[in-house]
């Protein structure tokens, strides 16, 4: 549902407030609107009508540009004004505010913790497989394979720092060159952007909220994909990242310092380590072809161990394996030698839930995956609810103005760069770009932050995560210092290069336009969001991985035609929108293709057919949960189910079944199906799979 737009400054152009054939205005609650239709699009319509809802004076004072679904909603304050409250009311209001703040921080805490547990769950489910991806020798010669391995591993372990640390240890032990590691780092950058996209899916209940949240999350994805699309070929051709970082590493005489500060982890670790603790070295060992690691569990059992270095007699296969002549002998049966052996004595078990269950990693992983996703979803809903109730009226105006307003002219251009710095700083504080961007997603969804502002914040987050990596590299031991620092710097300069490509000139901010396009599609066909996630983060990387394993000829044989078709489609699309006259009549639109090849409508019908049977029980469950929720908080309007459920329940209203209670900032009458399209919602077509 499209919200009421925020009222801005007066505009001198009165035509904006007049309705004609080309303008699109909302259907107002009480009065119907007349739309002029004409068959001849060439002839301009001259019949105009002032909107009946507002007076002309009001409109010139505060224009409403409602034909943009990306406009932020006005979060109206339904409460009593502060001045109208008595002393008791004021005290109650203060306590309510403090209570909400505590609740917000509490849910935010569990939200971050659930992200950490989600990462652990993914590592348990796919960590060993991810480690085995790295042990593929073809990475050395094939940068494309390195890229998809970076994506897949990071997606499977839900942590770019894990995949980066594996790369660092492989480079340090000469199993991988820095040149071969760079594409993997680029892939890890892409893979890490899946987390906030998953978080955005949690806001699928409200179309307009979902449109913004999903676009806000995928702006990160598109930035990373586009950066790789340009910078990977540049790197393969010039090796500029490798050369620049090598010069930097060689020009400094680094001494490994102290550990990188754990800022947010200081608060979250005490809780997350009660749930599960992982031995992340196992994944690295698998990546480095350690056969023994394949049988080890990732779940940490012993947290306190005593490691003692002792000289021990150990057997060796032959004299060639002797440490020195004086330290080898035979007992007549085997050859023995004296070796310094680190003997590990287990002292105390870890204090987490799964320590005594002895479940296989996969089982623990699946349990944690389900729990963490439920907690993540629950926390997100509650954060959105609390923010929705807090960010109303004046508070919302102040916050939105602070975040989204630019500096005064001529310094407006600096605002974005400040946002980049803020994003970098915040990410440095929380020590995770996933956490920062995931926390940003619901704020974009409810309309506190615009996508235009979220974009530089996200770019800053990308920089912030690399500064954390640089600090971690500087704290690493001598044998890995050089390689870890060079890789961290590669990551840093890759993101800097990406920002230079896709940020300074407004025209080049392609990720915003792409994300908005995807947001529009996903708002109309919500199943497409899941489809996008599967295609971009799993299917494409896995296909490229498979083709790469088959060898260059196969990869080129399949890849070249695919790339050619994509370029052809893009060129055609560009010509269709910019200068269709140069194209033959048939190519001016996509109608020459079967409907299923240029529209999602037939696919939507198919998917709706499959998901239809699950919709009723799902909505039933939602209704029950909402009832419980409303009973607990004593508010009849606190909970709502998605529009789909509303439509399914329309026939049940007479029987007294509660349906969604509209929130103060909902526009009940408008359902915007895609950008620029405004119509009264047709329940049959709007209720899609998700």
């Amino acid at each position: 549902m499209a919200p009421w737009p925020e009222l801005g400054d007066a505009q001198p152009n009165p035509s904006k407030y007049l309705e004609g054939a080309t303008s699109q205005q909302p259907i107002t609650p009480d009065k119907s609107k007349e739309t002029n239709k004409t068959d001849n699009t060439e002839v301009p319509v001259t019949k105009f009508e002032l909107l009946p809802t507002y007076s002309t004076a009001t409109l010139i004072e505060e224009p409403t540009e409602v034909d943009d679904p990306w406009n932020l909603p006005t979060l109206q304050d339904s409460g009593i004004k502060w001045s109208e409250r008595d002393a008791k009311g004021k005290i109650l209001c203060v306590f309510q505010g403090i209570g909400r703040l505590i609740l917000l921080l509490g849910f935010l805490y569990f939200f971050v913790c659930s992200l950490d547990v989600l990462s652990s769950a993914f590592q348990l489910v796919g960590g060993k497989m991810a480690g085995q991806f790295f042990s593929n020798s073809s990475i050395m010669s094939n940068p494309l394979l390195g890229l998809v391995i970076g994506v897949l591993v990071t997606v499977f372990v839900q942590s770019s720092s894990t995949s980066t640390s594996i790369v660092v240890s492989m480079v340090a032990s000469s199993l991988l060159t820095v040149r071969a590691a760079i594409p993997i780092i680029m892939g890890a950058n892409i893979g890490t952007s899946i987390t906030n996209t998953i978080v955005a899916l949690m806001q699928v209940g409200d179309r307009s909220e979902f449109r913004r949240a999903f676009a806000g999350a995928t702006v990160h994805d598109f930035f990373n994909w586009l950066s790789v699309l340009v910078l990977l070929p540049v790197e393969v051709a010039t090796h500029y990242l490798e050369v620049v970082t090598q010069l930097i590493v060689e020009s400094f005489h680094f001494k490994n310092g102290e550990d990188a500060p754990d800022l947010l982890k200081v608060i979250t670790k005490p809780f997350t380590k009660l749930i599960v603790q992982l031995d992340k070295k196992v994944i690295s060992q698998i990546a480095m072809n350690d056969e023994t690691a394949k049988n080890k569990s990732l779940v940490k059992i012993w947290c306190k161990t005593f490691t003692n270095m002792t000289q021990m007699n150990v057997t060796v296969p032959s004299m060639a394996n002797c440490t020195s002549h004086s330290l080898c002998w035979t007992d007549g049966i085997q050859i023995w030698t004296m070796k310094n052996v680190t003997y590990k004595e287990n002292i105390a078990k870890c204090q987490h839930i799964f320590v005594n269950f002895h479940l296989p990693d996969l089982a623990v992983g699946i349990i944690l995956l389900i729990i963490s996703l439920l907690v993540l979803c629950g926390c997100l809903i509650m954060i959105v609810k609390i923010l929705g109730s807090v960010l109303k009226g004046q508070v919302a105006t102040v916050i939105k103005k602070t975040i989204n307003t630019d500096f005064p002219f001529p310094f407006a251009w600096l605002t974005g760069y400040l946002a980049i710095l803020v994003g970098a700083g915040m990410t440095f504080i929380v020590q995770s770009s996933s956490v920062f961007t995931s926390a940003l997603t619901p704020l974009i969804g409810i309309g506190v932050i615009t996508i235009e502002r979220a974009y530089p914040l996200t770019l800053g987050s990308n920089i912030g995560t690399t500064t954390t990596a640089i600090l971690a590299a500087l704290a690493s031991p001598g044998n890995t210092l050089r390689s870890s620092l060079q890789i961290a710097l590669c990551h840093f300069f890759f993101n800097i290069s990406g920002i230079l490509l896709w940020y300074p000139i407004p025209f080049t901010r392609l990720p915003i336009r792409m994300a908005k396009g995807l947001g529009n599609i996903s708002a109309k066909y919500r199943w497409f969001a899941v489809f996008y996630l599967i295609i971009f983060f799993f299917l494409i990387p896995l296909t490229v991985f498979g083709l790469s394993l088959a060898g260059w000829p196969v990869l080129v044989g399949v890849g070249v035609p695919v790339v050619f078709i994509i370029i052809l489609v893009l060129c055609l699309r560009l010509l269709q929108s910019r200068c269709p006259r140069v194209l033959p009549k048939k190519l001016q639109n996509w109608n020459f293709l079967p409907l299923c090849m240029h529209s999602l409508k037939p696919w939507d019908a198919v998917i709706s057919k499959f998901t239809g049977p699950f919709q009723m029980p799902c909505c039933c469950c939602c209704r029950v949960c909402c009832r419980v929720c409303c009973l607990l908080c004593g508010c009849p309007k606190c909970c709502r189910c998605s529009k789909c459920c509303q439509d399914l329940e329309e026939g049940q209203e007479a029987q007294g079944v509660p349906v969604k209670a509209p929130e103060t900032f909902d526009n009940i009458t408008i359902s915007r199906e895609a950008q620029g399209e405004v119509r009264a919602p047709d329940s049959k077509t709007e209720c899609t799979a998700l």
Epitope: L327, C328, W329, T330, D331, I333, Q334, I335
Partner: antibody, heavy 121, light 107 residues
Framework: EVQLVESGGGWVQPGGSLRLSCAAS????????MYWVRQAPGKGLEYVSG????????YYVDSVKGRFTISRDNSKNLLYVHMGSLKPEDMAMYYC??????????????WGQGTLVTVSS | DIQMTQSPSSLSASIGDRVTITCRAS??????LNWYQQKPGKAPKVLIY???SLQSGVPSRFIGSGSGTDFTLTISSLQPEDFATYYC?????????FGQGTRLEIK
């Protein structure tokens, strides 16, 4: 007092087989590596085979590999060597010797009096 | 296999003499060398282990020395009961190998 007494020696035709035994006493048999060492008439000493204290590991010199089998019965304090496909060059005085404990450099600190094996047609 | 070469093969000496028998290994064996004494018709008996350690119950006139490839057994003052054949044995690598022996007889 440590004592090692060999038995089972005698005359055998080439290709025949023989089982030598060594009865140990006066020490904890199960804690020591045990060996067979032979000495051909008028020749030097030659290491033949060894077995670990638990009987799980053993070693054979190349010339006897596949033909001789060393074994022990720690419950009876007995050491054995089964000699198959005997050749004339296997004719020698066979000594049973005690070694140190596991992992200790091989030193034959106690020897039996030996048992003579004659291989001829 | 490591070859052990003793020299001389035989040696005549008088009671009270200082006698030195040498043993050379075909490769370095550290100090993992033992010396044995065998009297005719008897089983061998260990004298020295790990090149220089005297086996308990063995008279102190028997002195072992050396490391690497060259080792010596010295009898500081020859006694009547010392006339026998002496063998060196390496316990550095499998198979364990013995020297061919040095026969010490009364002059």
């Amino acid at each position: 007092e440590v004592q090692l007494v060999e038995s089972g020696g005698g005359w055998v035709q080439p290709g025949g087989s023989l089982r030598l035994s060594c009865a140990a006493s006066g020490f904890t048999f199960s804690s020591h590596i045990m060996y067979w060492v032979r000495q051909a008439p008028g020749k030097g000493l030659e290491y033949v085979s060894g077995i670990s204290s638990n009987g799980l590991s053993s070693y054979y010199v190349d010339s006897v590999k596949g033909r001789f089998t060393i074994s022990r019965d720690n419950s009876k304090n007995l050491l054995y060597v089964h000699m198959g496909s005997l050749k004339p060059e296997d004719m020698a005085m066979y000594y049973c010797a005690r070694g140190g404990r596991d992992r200790v450099p091989a030193v034959f600190d106690y020897w039996g009096q030996g048992t003579l094996v004659t291989v001829s047609s | 296999d490591i070859q052990m070469t003793q020299s001389p093969s035989s040696l005549s000496a008088s009671i009270g003499d200082r006698v030195t028998i040498t043993c050379r290994a075909s490769q370095s064996i550290g100090t993992f060398l033992n010396w044995y004494q065998q009297k005719p018709g008897k089983a061998p008996k260990v004298l020295i282990y790990v090149a220089s350690s005297l086996q308990s119950g063995v008279p102190s006139r028997f002195i072992g020395s050396g490391s690497g490839t060259d080792f010596t057994l010295t009898i500081s003052s020859l006694q009547p009961e010392d006339f026998a054949t002496y063998y060196c044995q390496q316990s550095y690598s499998v198979p364990i190998t013995f020297g061919q022996g040095t026969r010490l007889e009364i002059k």
